[in-house]
Every structure is written in C-alpha cells, then in structure tokens.
C-alpha cells in the first residue's frame, strides 16, 4: 500500500513537472500584418485562440519571452501566397525569407538563431503562387531572453493559423 502511495506521488510529481514545462504556439494575427517590402518584424500574434496556446512563457510586445532557463526546441512556419484576385505583383522576382531572432535584455544584443527562404520568380502569367518555409532548432535559452520573427514581403503572408506560426517548448534543464 505504501509502495502504491509512493507511486501515485511519483506520478503526480512527474505530471506536475510536465505541466510546468514551458511551451508556446503562436499564430499570426491576420488583422494586424505590417506593411513593407523589406524585412519587417511581425509583432501581432495570437496566443490563446484556435491552435494558439502558451504556458509558462510570456508573450509581450510582439516577442516570446523565456521565463525558465533551459534547452528549447524553437520552430517557425511561414507561408507566402499571392492570388491574382488581389492584384498584380509589382515585381516578379522576390526574396521570401524568415528570420528567428533572439534578443537578450541583460546584455543588450540580438542574434539570428535561424533563417530560411529562397529567391522566387512568381510569373504574372500564373493565377496563384505559394511558398512555405519551415525552420526549427535546439537552443539554450535563459530567462528574460526574447524570441521574435522577421519576414520579408509581409503583404504576401498567408494569414491562416495553419500557415503562419511559430513556437517553442522546453526539452530539458540546463545542467
């Protein structure tokens, strides 16, 4: 009986530790996509609707803030699209890029952790164009560090929650 009680306490401890593991999945806020034809920071994301969720991390001022030191898996998926019903592309040669950036407040500095993308020729003869970028990686992050997303040509972003999103989850503690 004592072993059973110990086992349940162990399960409970494990479960509460798992529940405390930080994670975030943020989806693009389609009503507030910035304009620009060069690299811009995407600051408007959902954290509590549809597929978007956050736990033991903070979303503030367009940045995902780490609350616990640890090794995290970071990921981002960005979709670009253009359909002729919205008009024509002013240029057919495009650089479609995403940059995942870490900013440290304690030692003011910014580092690009991941980038992805391609140069594309989107011919005006086609009715529809689509391009997707997915990047992911394993990083040591400290409490207070901030993760943000920058993209080129935000006017071409696909605004759906299953198309443009980023996130993070803690994998293990720093020894």
């Amino acid at each position: 009986e004592k072993a059973m009680v110990d086992g349940s306490w162990l399960d409970l401890a494990k479960r509460s530790k798992l529940e405390a593991q930080p994670f975030a999945h943020l989806t693009i806020n389609a009503t507030d996509i910035p304009s620009g034809s060069h690299k811009v920071s995407l600051s408007s994301w959902y954290h509590d609707r549809g597929w978007a969720k956050i736990s033991n991390m903070t979303f503030s001022n367009g940045k995902l803030i780490v609350n616990q030191d640890g090794f995290y898996y970071l990921y981002a998926n960005i979709c670009f699209r253009h359909h002729e019903t919205s008009g024509d592309l002013a240029t057919e040669y495009l650089q479609l890029m995403v940059y995942v950036t870490k900013t440290s407040i304690k030692i003011p500095s910014s580092h690009t952790l991941m980038k992805g993308g391609s140069t594309k020729y989107w011919s005006g003869n086609s009715e529809f164009h689509f391009y997707s970028i997915n990047v992911g990686g394993f990083f040591k992050l400290r409490s207070g560090e901030e993760i943000s997303i920058e993209v080129s040509n935000p006017s071409l972003l696909d605004p759906d929650q299953d198309a443009t999103y980023f996130g993070a989850f803690k994998v293990r503690d720093i020894d």
């Epitope: 008009g87 024509d88 057919e92």
Partner: antibody, heavy 126, light 103 residues
C-alpha cells in the same frame, strides 16, 4: 495635393502612333504605379496596362500587347503611353490613373485607382 | 477572365430617393471590388474600394456592400450632383456602367 495632368487632344490617321503623357505632382512618383485606362464612345472603361514607376516594370492587357509601350521619366515625374498601328476603333478618351498601393508599403498593385488624369481625347480618322 | 455585369444599365430617380446599383462578377472575387463615378469631361472618381470602404472625401450617402460575386452600391439620398455614370471594377475588368438621371 495629388494631381495627374495629361497632354492635350490628338488627331491621327489610321496606322499612325500616338504618345500621351501624364505628369504627376503632390506625391513621390517612384513609390506608385500608374495605370492607363481608356473609354471609347458608348463603351465601358477599358484597362490597358500599368507601369511601376519605381522599377519600370510593366504589364499590359492581352488586347494591346505588341501595340503599346508605357515608359516613365522619374526625374520629370511623368509617365507616357504610346499606342501604335492606330485604327478607328482606338478613338477614345485615354486616362492615366494612380494605383493606391504604395510600393514602400508592399508589392501588390491592387488596382485601386485613387487619382485620375483629366483624360486625353485621341481621334483616329482618315 | 473575370467578367463584371452591372444592373440596371440606366435608372431615373427623384432627389432624395435611395438608389441601388448591383454588380455581379463571373466568379468569386472576395471583396476586391471598387466603384467609380464618371461625369462627362471630368476625371473619374473613386468612391468605394474593397467592396465597402469609403474613399476619403466621398460623401457618406455613398456606401458599398457585398462579397464573393455580388455587390451593391447604394446612394442613400440622391442629390443633383450625383448625376453621372457609375462603374464597378475588379482589377482589369470594369462593369458596363449604370447611368443615373434625375426624374
């Protein structure tokens, strides 16, 4: 304020060419596209083509492909539309119009014609 | 190629009347539809863009609605200065126009 001022009326014989100018003022010419639209007597408005004043890229209606040239002079903030091999059915009022999409804000030419020139009557008659 | 069809082709109404013009697209165009006013000898004027957004400087008696393939332009209280031909437009395609006259 934003203004588009077009050149004056022209009369041409069939087979000839005409070149219409459109001088822009009151905004940064290079940041917008200029469209050319015409209206023949009793007909609906008809889109002919556009030029991205910043990089010179152009797009034309299939109907005018091979007969139309659109150019711009950024120093003079002026766009030009030349139509060749004129026929009587090209008799129309030709308009230039600014696209509302600012190329600094994005790269889609959205076909919102927010400012128009006063129109240039081109008459093709033998 | 998308074709825009307007109805009616002309209408006659009294000052103060509510006037409605319909525009249909041959396929769905979301909300990418604009309305213009054209008076003889004058430059055309953008009234409504994106199906329902009023262009700055345009009187509030003009309004637009619709999405997909069916759209309407409404003049809530017709004024003498509204005598003109009205065109709907989606990218490269214009409707054939609706001529509005005063009774």
């Amino acid at each position: 304020q934003v203004q588009l001022v077009q050149s004056g009326a022209e009369v041409r014989k069939p087979g000839a060419s005409v070149k219409v100018s459109c001088k822009a003022s009151g905004y940064d010419f290079s940041n917008y596209a200029i469209h050319w639209v015409r209206q023949a007597p009793g007909q609906r408005l008809e889109w002919m083509g556009w030029i991205n004043a910043g990089n010179g890229n152009t797009k034309f209606s299939q109907k005018f492909q091979g007969r139309i040239t659109v150019t711009r002079d950024t120093a003079a903030s002026t766009a030009y539309m030349e139509l060749r091999s004129l026929r009587s059915e090209d008799t129309a009022v030709y308009y230039c119009a600014r696209d509302d999409s600012n190329m600094v804000r994005g790269i889609i030419i959205a076909y919102y014609f927010d400012y128009w020139g006063q129109g240039t009557l081109v008459t093709v008659s033998s | 190629e998308i074709v825009m069809t307007q109805s009616p082709s002309s209408l006659s109404a009294s000052v103060g009347d509510r006037v409605t013009i319909t525009c249909r697209a041959s396929q769905s165009i979301s909300r990418y539809l604009n309305w213009y006013q054209l008076k003889p000898g004058k430059a055309p004027r953008l009234l409504i863009y994106g199906a329902s957004s009023l262009q700055s400087g345009v009187p509030s008696r003009f309004s637009g609605s619709g999405s997909g393939a069916e759209f309407t332009l409404t003049i809530s209280s017709l004024q003498p200065e509204d005598i003109a031909t009205y065109y709907c437009q989606h990218t490269r395609a214009f409707g054939q126009g609706t001529k509005v006259e005063i009774k």
